[in-house]
């Protein structure tokens, strides 16, 4: 009951060369504490030292990876110290090259449906970690499947809700050095769609344009969306614009596509700034076709 609470800020996954703050909270409010590392390489700066409130550790090296506990000063205990805290595992990233992270069938996931996150690498990683940005809990640990070309893991996530949506990265590690991780994969934004009514999408001057002509796509709704997202079928990225309140009471964003050379099917979505990974239903698709060009789509 007198165990203090150890936490790591901004999180337990730390890039090599960066710093991490270890904070030891005593429930009674005793400010002094000691730190110990249970496994891996020793960290000399911890030994025979008393810290106050928190300890800024770094620049972090692979030697800092491992399990930490703290004891807070405790005048009423026979030893003068509390029982050891909960363990905190510090994982150091950047030790191996980054894996790749993909979403199947794609990163826009209907509310209530399931998405498969696939992390793969040409390095033979026995373990993968999946981490969502802004979450301080330990990342999800997954067992990799080894094959001749490297390794991979598939993680089925769902049913999709705004709580699961966010920016994901994955890391790889090898069995004998479990807390020394690869560099992070490129970030993957998983978005839950279908939470709000669909906006309308229209084209000015119209959906059929001459090659090289300017076209503007307007996304609008009576919902109080802060942001609109425009996506083109078969393209990974999306354009993003802030919504503006129009005289007619709609919230609108105009996407100038500039001189167009190729058409395509466009959709737009609305979202709120407070929940950037939660989007509306998609607008009805708007086919933009380009004349005077050998390729219409």
């Amino acid at each position: 009951q007198d165990k203090p609470f150890l936490s790591a800020w901004p999180g337990t996954v730390v890039s090599e060369g960066q710093h991490v703050t270890l904070q030891c909270r005593s429930r009674l409010g005793f400010n002094e504490f000691s730190l110990s590392k249970e496994d891996g390489m020793p960290v000399p700066e911890l030994y025979n030292r008393i810290f106050r409130n928190s300890f800024l550790m770094g620049p972090v090296t692979p030697a800092h990876a491992g399990t930490y506990r703290c004891c807070s000063s405790h005048p009423h205990s026979p030893t003068g110290w509390s029982a050891p805290s909960n363990p905190v595992v510090i994982m150091v990233t950047g030790v191996h090259r980054k894996p790749s992270l993909l979403a199947h069938p794609g990163p826009l996931v209907k509310s209530g449906e399931t998405v498969i996150l696939q992390c793969w690498s040409d390095v033979r990683f026995e373990r993968f970690l999946l981490h969502r940005e802004g979450i301080t809990e330990d990342p999800l640990r997954l067992v990799g499947q080894l094959h001749d070309a490297g390794s991979q893991v598939n993680y089925s996530m769902g049913p999709m809700t705004p709580a699961l949506a966010g920016t994901y990265r994955c890391f790889g590690s090898v069995t004998h050095l479990p807390y020394e991780l690869s560099a992070p994969s490129d970030p993957l934004d998983i978005v839950v769609v279908g939470l709000y009514g669909k906006p309308s999408l229209s084209a000015q001057p119209g959906p059929t344009v001459q090659a090289g002509e300017n076209v503007t796509l307007s996304c609008s709704s009576r919902s109080l969306f802060d942001i609109y997202h425009l996506s083109r079928e078969a393209e990974a990225g999306e354009l993003r614009l802030t919504a503006v309140l129009r005289v007619n009471g709609t919230f609108q964003a105009n996407f100038p596509l500039g001189p167009v050379t190729h058409g395509g099917n466009y959709r737009c979505f609305g979202s709120f700034r407070a929940l950037p990974h939660a989007w509306s239903d998609p607008s009805d698709p708007l086919p933009v076709s380009v004349t005077g060009n050998s390729r219409h789509l």
Epitope: F5, Q23, R25, L28, S54
Partner: antibody, heavy 119, light 107 residues
């Protein structure tokens, strides 16, 4: 349901002492830290100190050392705070407040006890 | 001890308004900041802990943010029952200290 029921208002003379109580129910008394907080009239809040009912361990705000003494009676699940050598500066509402295990020091509050020091 | 400087002291707003209160710590408190609401004649009630986490049962119109020394508490759409004094408090280092309070009044 967690409840912290504090003793009634006290009118005391300067130089005297007062002991106020915080009767708890709805949880295991010895598993949570009990803190005490002072609120002078129209002013902010000041942490006085905390006590661990499990072992009687205490931690005081230096400002209140010698002024406040925190104790518990585990058999009746009551926390006490005694204030001594009272002056008009000690006139205030005093709250007991329980922690939530580790996240927050003041998760549940008693209704407060008004102590008035007057000749 | 750590000083928590809270601003403004008073806020006069209409129902439906958005309200922001700020708290500045005299040194870094990481994210160890809580926010409390004290309605007239009542004891304080915990709203936000760890700077941005809503406590159990607290409506989602109440939000908090910040890290280090600068913290913000927001009521997205003020309601009549939000009439109260709001306090920030640092949980980082004892003695635990509170801001001076912001009195929210509804027009």
């Amino acid at each position: 349901e967690v409840q912290l029921q504090q003793s009634g208002p006290e009118l005391v003379k300067p130089g005297a002492s007062v002991k106020i109580s915080c009767k708890t129910s709805g949880y295991t008394f010895t598993e949570y830290i009990m803190h005490w907080v002072k609120q002078s009239h129209g002013k902010s809040l000041e942490w006085i100190g905390g006590i661990n009912p499990n072992n009687g361990g205490t931690n005081y705000n230096q400002k209140f050392k010698g002024k406040a003494t925190l104790t518990v009676d585990t058999s009746s699940s009551i926390a006490y705070m005694e204030l001594r050598s009272l002056t008009s500066e000690d006139s205030a509402v005093y709250y007991c407040a329980r922690d939530d295990g580790y996240y927050v020091k003041f998760a549940y509050w008693g209704q407060g006890t008004l102590v008035t020091v007057s000749a | 001890s750590i000083v928590m400087t809270q601003t403004p002291k008073f806020l006069l707003v209409s129902a439906g308004d958005r309200v922001t209160i700020t708290c500045k710590a005299s040194q870094s408190v990481i994210n160890d900041v809580a926010w409390y609401q004290q309605k007239p004649g009542q004891s304080p009630k915990l709203l936000i802990y760890y700077a941005s986490n809503r406590y159990t049962g607290v409506p989602d119109r109440f939000t908090g943010s910040g890290y280090g020394t600068d913290f913000t508490f927001t009521i997205s759409t003020v309601q009549a029952e939000d009439l109260a004094v709001y306090f920030c408090q640092q949980d980082y280092s004892s003695p635990f200290t509170f801001g001076s309070g912001t009195k929210l009044e509804i027009k």
